[in-house]
């Protein structure tokens, strides 16, 4: 087989699901031709003429088109086609978890559309265009410093997608109060009190982007549970990074975890990294079968009986 | 028999636009790829542009890219050739040729030519 | 782009004799090369295609031979009615489609 050198591949990008016909080149209509996708011949019967048509186009349609003269295996025509769709509306947020340093915006779209996008962001503070910087290792989220602290004039963002298939946007608006979340609270870790079967400490640390915790204080939410409940057990802090639960059950495993929230204004982070202890317990006694199984009885049953004080609720219900 | 009849052809000041057209009959127009080849006076050939049978491909020479467009009428069996921003080396007869359907292609059917004059 | 190189651009022949003309590739191009006839006030003619092949209705007089990048047209008794200017084409690799510059055979 003798193939031409050619320019690079015809690039083409259809609609998932359309019809497509694919000319060779600038073959005539009645040119004998053959048509291989990737290396592998193709029916004859999907042909129109010299062209190729292609009907409910799939992703796996995606591929290396050629078409050669019939007699002499010239490679006449490439095309490298790739199927898709166009982008639909793009999800944006974004959240300052560096306060009062800036925020960062995030986006991502909806469904797939299988073939590459580009992503053009804008950011209004009133009527200044303020810069927005890639963010180094995350591709789909930028960065925006604060000029202005305290501010009454909202932001407005923007994002605009586009691909070869079709185009689309979205912005949202938003004073810089509502986006502040700071992020989860670093370190957790919860210890047995020794002597104290119902203890449990926990100390935790402000998160390490939070950039000033003396000016811009945070205030800690800490929810616990034994592992054999679902239900958990809440305690809002108002200062420090540590807290020593009480009510715990002896001699089972509880997890724990830590949100935190700028005092004043915004949102509650996410949970932090759970922390697992299990209180402390007496070293065990020498005990005859039977009682082992009557001590196990009884300690199983009353561990099911949630204590009396507990609260259900959620950061995120949580007013500022 | 068949014959491709081009018109169009005029004296222009450098600058100015043009438009030739090609007239064919005898073959059935809506299967052949559509070629302008120019030859400026006393000169060799030189391939213009193509268009494919279904005109959902062009190619162009480099020396006209972006000034000349080539576009067909197969309802009409007419081939076209907008020349814009022309020069004075654009001078010459043009003519067009229909491809063959066999490879290696050659230009299997020519017109008598059309001469373009670009001067001041 | 391929580069059509022809030679000689002129030569000068009788009535009766064999002359051939070269074409050479800047590249290899297969036997992918056409040669046409062009008179005085007339558009190009076929002869040869696909480096060899004789298009129908010329004479058996013209004949062309090369593959790769070296190729000639022989014509091997001159008539009058040859007296013309020969171009050689390649359509290896198109667009651009490329030509020859010509070679101007005259009356010696």
């Known amino acids: 087989q003798r193939h031409s050198p050619q320019e690079a591949p015809h690039v083409q990008y259809e609609r998932l699901g359309s019809d497509v016909t694919l000319p060779c080149g600038t073959a005539n209509w009645d040119a004998a031709v053959t048509w291989r996708v990737n290396g592998t011949d193709l029916a004859p019967d999907l042909l129109n003429g010299s062209q190729l048509v292609l009907h409910g186009l799939e992703l796996g349609h995606s591929g290396l088109y050629a078409c050669f003269h019939r007699d002499s295996w010239h490679l006449r025509h490439q095309v490298l086609l790739h199927v898709g769709l166009p982008p639909r509306e793009p999800v944006l947020s974004c959240r300052s978890n560096t306060y009062p340093k800036g925020f960062y915006c995030s986006w991502h779209l909806p469904t797939p559309t299988y073939i590459p996008n580009t992503f053009n962001v804008t950011v209004l503070h009133g009527s200044k265009i303020m810069v927005c910087e890639k963010d180094p290792a995350l591709k789909n989220r930028c960065h925006i410093r604060y000029m202005h602290l305290f501010s009454t004039i909202k932001y407005k963002v923007s994002i605009s997608v586009s691909n070869a298939l079709g185009h689309n946007a979205t912005a949202i608006t938003f004073d810089e109060f509502t986006i502040v979340k700071p992020d989860p609270p670093e370190n957790v870790v919860a210890r047995p009190v020794p002597s104290n079967p119902r203890r449990l400490e926990v100390t935790w640390q402000t998160p390490s982007t939070w950039p000033d915790p003396e000016s811009f204080p945070l205030k800690f939410f800490l929810r616990y549970r034994p592992l054999i409940l679902d239900q958990w057990q809440h305690v809002e802090l108002s200062d420090g990074t540590a807290h020593t639960i009480t009510d715990a059950y002896a001699g089972k495993e509880y997890i724990i975890q830590v949100a935190a929230k700028d005092n004043e204004i915004g949102t509650w982070s996410d949970w932090s990294v759970a922390a697992h202890a299990t209180p402390w317990t007496e070293e065990p006694r020498h005990l005859t079968t039977e009682a082992q199984a009557a001590e196990t009885t009884t300690s199983t049953t009353s561990s099911l009986a949630p204590p009396p004080t507990t609260k259900i609720c959620d950061p995120g219900e949580l007013g500022s | 028999q068949v014959q491709l009849v081009e018109s169009g052809g005029d004296v222009v000041q450098p600058g100015r636009s043009l438009r030739l057209s090609c007239a064919a009959s005898g073959f059935t127009f809506s299967y052949y790829g559509m070629h302008w080849v120019r030859q400026p006076p006393g000169k060799g050939l030189e391939w213009v542009t193509i268009i494919s049978f279904d005109g959902s491909q062009k190619y162009y020479a480099d020396s006209v890219k972006g000034r000349f467009t080539i576009s067909r009428d197969n309802s009409k069996n007419t081939v076209f050739l907008q020349m814009n921003s022309l020069r004075t080396e654009d001078t010459g007869f043009y003519y067009c040729?229909?491809?063959?359907?066999?490879?290696?292609?050659?230009?299997?059917?020519w017109g008598q030519g059309t001469l373009v004059t670009v001067s001041s | 782009d391929i580069q059509m190189t022809q030679s000689p651009s002129s030569l000068s022949a009788s009535v009766g004799d064999r002359v051939t003309i070269t074409c050479r590739a800047s590249?290899?191009?297969?036997?992918?090369l056409n040669w046409y006839q062009q008179k005085p006030g007339k558009a190009p003619k076929l002869l040869i295609y696909a480096a060899s092949s004789l298009q129908s209705g010329v004479p058996s007089r013209f004949s062309g031979s090369g593959s790769g990048t070296d190729f000639t047209l022989t014509i091997s008794s001159l008539q009058p009615e040859d007296f013309a200017t020969y171009y050689c084409q390649q359509s290896y690799s198109t667009p651009p489609i490329t030509f020859g510059q010509g070679t101007r055979l005259e009356i010696k």
């Open positions: 590249q290899s191009i297969s036997s992918y």
């Open positions: 040729a229909a491809q063959s359907s066999t490879w290696p292609e050659y230009f299997q059917y």
